[in-house]
């Protein structure tokens, strides 16, 4: 297969990651789903220099990350262990918090205003974030 | 001018498989995610599959989902579906279409002539 | 699975205005697409993103989307406007279209 050696169009470099950021809201699912058909994924936050960067273009906004735990566990989207790595969460959460009255708990994770993590119902239309990363070779099913 | 091509429709027997392809001109054919459709004689149009323009990511219709397969090659400018296990509710016209940008915010906005599959005994 | 459900059939007058509609839980929250095929031709994308035009769709083809319904609005109806017209929209990872509404001309 082929490497990535820039960015697309309208997407950000850092760190040899490529960015897209929003400016439309959509649910959790629909927003991987996007990142997946850019053959991206959803951001994965592995460090305080890669929050700091995400948080400076998104701004005050509620953005989804590539997190969640809709099958259990905490994960992230693109197998990085969550156990062992970088976490911003605010205080006291995650809280599955059942009291909005939606059905269910809260299941994904997203970026606050203030940058740091929440989790909230998976439906709800928020911004998002996607990203690939450069130099590493496209995942071309082999042809049949 | 920007144009899709299909070829390597026909007859099957049910149970047997068949590969088609859609060779893409005239636009930059990796950065465009792609799809099958198909129409049943005399019905509407139903989605079959679509591909991500770096072939990493695919979905599946649920009809098809497991006897499908939709790939491509960048370097060939190509789209293929391999068809197993055909039934005769598969018996169609198949168009290859082209996105005009990513699949969740945006249509189809260019289609083959469409290659016409019959699956009978 | 998510249904995307259309008038069978829609009859309008020549120089009148045809309006389609297209339902579907939340549609609004979703983008709407519009086709049209006619008789023995590959389907063309009239209406994307539930209201832009692809370049060489006339002035005439309009699309809104609110609530569970889009609407394709074609004006001044001709002749060769006489074809089925498909919505489609994304949800839950699947392409999904109506059933094809047939436009015929009187």
């Known amino acids: 297969g082929s490497e990535r050696t820039c960015c697309p169009v309208n997407w950000v470099e850092h760190e040899r990651s490529c960015y897209w950021f929003s400016r439309s809201g959509k649910a959790w699912a629909d927003a991987d789903n996007y990142c997946r058909l850019e053959d991206a994924h959803l951001v994965v936050v592995t460090s305080w220099e890669e929050q700091k960067f995400v948080q400076h273009h998104i701004g005050p906004v509620n953005t989804w990350m590539g997190l969640h735990d809709q099958n259990g566990p905490w994960k992230w989207v693109d197998g990085t262990d969550y156990e062992t790595g970088f976490k911003n969460w605010r205080p006291e959460q995650p809280d599955d918090w059942y009291g909005h009255g939606l059905g269910g708990g809260e299941d994904c994770a997203h970026f606050t205003d203030d940058g740091r993590w929440n989790d909230d119902v998976c439906q709800r239309p928020y911004r998002w974030v996607c990203e690939t990363e450069l130099d590493k070779a496209s995942q071309e099913p082999p042809l049949l | 001018e920007v144009q899709l091509l299909e070829s390597g429709g026909g007859l099957v027997q049910p149970g047997g498989s068949l590969r088609f392809s859609c060779a893409a001109s005239g636009f930059t054919f990796s950065s465009h995610a792609m799809s099958w459709v198909r129409q049943a004689p005399g019905k509407g149009l139903e989605w079959v599959s679509v591909i991500s323009g770096g072939g990493s990511s695919t979905y599946y219709a649920d009809s098809v989902k497991g006897r499908f397969t939709i790939s491509r090659d960048n370097s060939k400018n190509t789209l293929y579906l391999q068809m197993n296990s055909l039934r005769a509710e598969d018996t169609a016209v198949y168009y290859c279409a082209k996105w005009r940008g990513n699949p969740t915010d945006y249509g189809m906005d260019v289609w083959g002539q469409g290659t016409t599959v019959t699956v009978s005994s | 699975s998510y249904e995307l459900t259309q008038p069978p059939s829609v009859s309008v007058s020549p120089g009148q205005t045809a309006s389609i509609t297209c339902s579907g839980d939340?549609?609004?929250?979703?983008?709407a697409s519009w086709y049209q095929q006619k008789p023995g031709q590959s389907p063309v994308l009239v209406i994307y993103?539930?209201?832009k035009r692809p370049s060489g769709i006339p002035e005439r083809f309009s699309g809104s989307n609110s609530g569970n319904t889009a609407t394709l609005t074609i004006g001044g109806i001709q002749a060769m406007d006489e074809a089925d017209y498909y919505c489609q929209a994304w949800d839950s990872s699947t392409v999904v279209f109506g059933g094809g509404t047939k436009l015929t001309v009187l």
């Open positions: 939340k549609l609004g929250d979703k983008y």
């Open positions: 993103q539930d209201n």
